[in-house]
């Protein structure tokens, strides 16, 4: 039975040209995390495998950095980066847990006045 829950940063906004950390956390389960996939809609951004470490998709290599932890840092943001991001935690023996984050990338002047959520 899958007892775990994924906590995410929820809906976040950031300004164009800046960077943002996408973070998920799996709790309430003793399952062992074997791999975390980060996806944007249907595109794979990155994989963090417990044994093999990080793999960043070639098309995102310049703008995506691994970490902190199992999170993902998006850099040089553009308005086109607005959208849904998913963290998929593959665990033994529970299977896969999925968390959702919505990122809105705003023009600098708008973002300065809008609420922003940043992970310390």
């Amino acid at each position: 039975m899958m007892t775990g829950t994924i906590e995410t940063t929820g809906n976040i906004s950031a300004e164009k040209g800046g960077s943002i950390i996408l973070q998920c956390h799996l709790s309430s389960t003793t399952a062992q995390v074997t791999q975390v996939n980060w996806e944007q809609q249907d595109q794979l951004l990155a994989i963090c495998n417990a044994d093999l470490g990080w793999h960043i998709s070639p098309s995102f290599k310049d703008r995506v950095a691994p970490g902190p932890g199992l999170g993902l840092t998006l850099q040089s943001l553009t308005v086109n980066d607005t959208g849904e991001y998913f963290c998929i935690y593959h665990t033994y023996p529970d299977g896969a847990y999925t968390g959702r984050i919505f990122l809105e990338v705003l023009e600098s002047s708008v973002a300065e006045h809008g609420a922003r959520f940043q992970i310390p």
Partner: antibody
Framework: EVQLVQSGSELKKPGASVKVSCKAS????????MNWVRQAPGRGLEWMGW????????AYAQDFTERFVFSLDTSVTTAYLQISSLKAEDTAVYYC?????????????WGQGTLVTVSS | DIQLTQSPSFLSASVGDRVTITCRAS??????LAWYQQKPGKAPRVLIY???TLQSGVPSRFSGSESGTEFTLTISSLQPEDLATYYC?????????FGQGTKVEIK
């Protein structure tokens, strides 16, 4: 080369305790969940449970919740199975088996097995 | 808990025969099934995982298939070294479990 090397055969009296070791080499112990499997003489394979090698948290199958303890010593890359208050029906070969961290979690490497005989 | 029913429990076949072992799950388990071979006095070794994927180093005469909740291990041409007991295992949730085993004898 991945290897799981188990401790030697044990002959114990009813009521005694036994501790079976499983020494992992050729990979990082803490990246792969470890399972324990029992095989009584002339019988099939019985999954006893597993230990989260990252956190040290064990999970036991229904028939193995009382007298069985899974533990780890990561400093010597070894997993342990301890059985207390031994009974004649605990006579069996005990195997440790590593969970592959593919998406389907089969057991890709097994120890050679440890025969525990309980007899007065 | 999901139960696995393996059949037959015993079979005897000649070298070169095609051998089929079946494992039926009491509920859907997708492709979360593995097949193991255990030779007398030895530890099990994985043959097939994900219902159909051949483990590296395993001879190609072994294959796996699935149809709904029924899974099949096939040995296309039985060899003398295939004398063993074969087990299926469900992998998709706690608790894991094994089938009862199929002992394969060479005629």
């Amino acid at each position: 080369e991945v290897q799981l090397v188990q401790s030697g055969s044990e002959l114990k009296k009813p009521g005694a305790s036994v501790k079976v070791s499983c020494k992992a080499s050729g990979y990082t112990l803490t990246n792969y969940p470890m399972n324990w499997v029992r095989q009584a003489p002339g019988r099939g394979l019985e999954w006893m449970g597993w230990i989260n090698t990252n956190t040290g948290s064990p999970a036991y199958a229904q028939d193995f919740t009382e007298r069985f303890v899974f533990s780890l010593d990561t400093s010597v890359t070894t997993a342990y199975l301890q059985i207390s208050s031994l009974k004649a029906e605990d006579t069996a070969v005990y195997y440790c088996a590593r969970t592959a961290i593919t998406s389907v979690y089969h057991f890709d490497y097994w120890g050679q097995g440890t025969l525990v005989t309980v007899s007065s | 808990d999901i139960q696995l029913t393996q059949s037959p429990s015993f079979l005897s076949a000649s070298v070169g025969d095609r051998v089929t072992i079946t494992c039926r799950a009491s509920q859907g388990i997708s492709s979360y099934l593995a097949w193991y071979q255990q030779k007398p006095g030895k530890a099990p070794r994985v043959l097939i995982y994900g219902a159909t994927t051949l483990q590296s180093g395993v001879p190609s005469r072994f294959s796996g298939s699935e149809s709904g909740t029924e899974f099949t291990l096939t040995i296309s041409s039985l060899q003398p070294e295939d004398l063993a007991t074969y087990y299926c295992q469900k992998l998709n949730s706690h608790p894991s479990s094994f089938g009862q085993g199929t002992k394969v004898e060479i005629k």
